[in-house]
């Protein structure tokens, strides 16, 4: 991958090991957990990360400590199963043999069940509504360029295609980033909402996955924007089948 | 050149545990995972797991965690195996290899025998 | 785990024969197939690795072929040097398992 050609490291994920036996003993980069090689030219994607923070040994000097307020989903962390390309498998079970449904971003979609339980197809999570409350600041950031900035992270940084930020919504101190992307929309190469969301998600919380940058520092016409608080709502392209009827968070 | 030179022959005891090692010369140790195989007589190769020197990771085949244990000494660019708990079904050659795949060493035979 | 399937358990060929080894493995592997060779009491020696790759000092003869799931490995013109057991390998994902083997017999 040439992104870790000259020093056979991987640029976009720190929870990789790197090493030059890869095709034409060029760098290949394994995720931790699984070993699955991956392109990091790329956000590597989030079943792979997820898969890497609960199976690497709790002294890997790579390791990003798990922040004690992580919230990804209602279920908190799990060691997901991931299908060859690296996608969560629609069907997830833990050790006991409890399994359930759980979306394009491996969030819970059903009700708990036992080995019986079928799900057929991975649902995709087509809107992923990001909401940040920022710290106390002078006065309220201009909307514009509080705006252009998180178009310009997303592009940039988790080289997402700006087609896929439908909207940011401003309210102080409240911030809503809208991501949208359908099956159809999303072409071979394009970066997932998903996988974005959760690179941001993990900046955010400051366990940045990049490797040897520096955290993230948000700044809004030299303004630090500093979060204190993040939701994140993950919207499928079929509703969720529970009991009793919610929004994943 | 790159060689892999690993321990000699090891009779023994039913119940108790030994350690083998392989030792790399003609290449960065840290650069590469090192893998250990598994050959019982006359039969095929099974995968035990690897270690990757330069961080200390491991990674077991689940058949074999909690018999094997894999270790590295980057000073003397030696990495090593412990079997604990031997019985005849652990008799075998056990070989390692550099994750490149073109290098092996040269095997060593495990014999458990009361 | 990745499940590799090797056949057939023995062929036997004639010097200068083709011969072809097979190996199919259970998901999808890409390129991630390597192909050893082992003779009586050796270390298995690296043939072809990532399904076609040729390996330095490794006869011409030796070619590899596949992705997916379908590989194979061929010896344009068999020698009597080339007897002993074939094995495919992947490195996919962990763990890195084996295929059972084809022993090659000359007549």
């Known amino acids: 991958h040439t992104a870790a050609q000259d020093n056979c490291t991987c640029p976009t994920n720190k929870m990789t090991v790197c090493s030059p036996d890869g095709p034409g003993g060029r760098c290949q980069c394994r995720a931790l957990g699984s070993g699955m090689a991956v392109d990091c030219s790329t956000l590597t994607s989030k079943c792979l990360l997820l898969k890497a923070r609960m199976s690497a040994p709790k002294n890997a000097r790579t390791l990003v400590r798990p922040s004690e307020h992580a919230l990804v989903d209602n279920d908190g962390l799990y060691d997901p199963d991931c299908d060859p390309e690296g996608r969560f498998k629609a069907r997830q079970c833990n050790q006991t043999s409890v399994c359930w449904c759980v979306n394009s971003v491996g969030v819970r979609r059903t009700d708990k069940g036992d080995l019986s339980l079928r799900c057929d197809e991975l649902v995709r999570t087509h809107h992923i509504l990001i909401d940040l409350r920022h710290r106390p600041t002078a006065g309220a950031f201009n909307h514009s360029d509080l705006d252009a900035e998180l178009r310009r992270l997303f592009r940039e940084r988790y080289r997402l295609h700006p087609k896929f930020v439908a909207a940011v919504h401003y309210e102080q101190p409240t911030i809503q980033i809208e991501l949208r992307q359908n099956t159809s929309q999303k072409a071979a190469g394009d970066v997932d909402i998903g996988d974005a969301a959760y690179y941001f998600e993990r900046d955010i919380k400051g366990e940045s996955l990049f490797q040897g940058r520096g955290g993230l520092d948000l700044r809004v016409r030299g303004e630090p924007l500093q979060v204190e608080r993040t939701l994140i709502y993950y919207l499928d392209e079929i509703p969720p089948k529970f009991s009793m009827k919610r929004l994943t968070a | 050149q790159v060689q892999l030179q690993q321990s000699g022959a090891e009779l023994v005891r039913p119940g108790t545990s030994v350690k083998i090692s392989c030792k790399a010369s003609?290449?960065?140790?840290?650069?590469?995972?090192l893998d250990w195989i598994k050959q019982r007589p006359g039969q095929g190769l099974e995968w035990i797991g690897n270690?990757?020197?330069?961080?200390?990771?491991?990674n077991y085949n689940e058949e074999f965690r909690g018999k094997a244990t894999l270790t590295a000494d980057t000073s003397s660019r030696t990495a090593f195996m412990q079997l604990s708990s031997l019985t005849s079904e652990d008799s075998a050659v056990y070989f390692c290899?550099?994750?490149?795949?073109?290098?092996w060493g040269q095997g060593t035979l495990v014999t458990v025998s009361a | 785990d990745i499940l590799l399937t090797q056949s057939p358990a023995i062929l036997s060929v004639s010097p200068g024969e083709r011969v072809s080894f097979s190996c199919r493995a259970s998901?999808?592997?890409?390129?991630?197939i390597h192909w050893y060779q082992q003779r009586t009491n050796g270390s298995p020696r690296l043939l072809i690795k990532?399904?076609?790759e040729s390996i330095s000092g490794i006869p011409s003869r030796f070619s590899g072929s596949g992705s997916g799931t379908d590989f194979s490995l061929t010896i344009n013109s068999v020698e009597s040097e080339d007897i002993g057991d074939y094995y495919c390998?992947?490195?996919?994902?962990?763990?890195?398992?084996f295929g059972s083997g084809t022993k090659l017999e000359i007549k």
């Open positions: 270690i990757f020197p330069g961080g200390d990771y491991t």
């Open positions: 390998q992947h490195s996919y994902t962990w763990p890195f398992t």
């Open positions: 990532y399904s076609s």
């Open positions: 998901q999808n592997i890409g390129t991630s």
């Open positions: 003609g290449y960065t140790f840290t650069n590469y995972w």
């Open positions: 290899a550099r994750s490149s795949y073109d290098y």
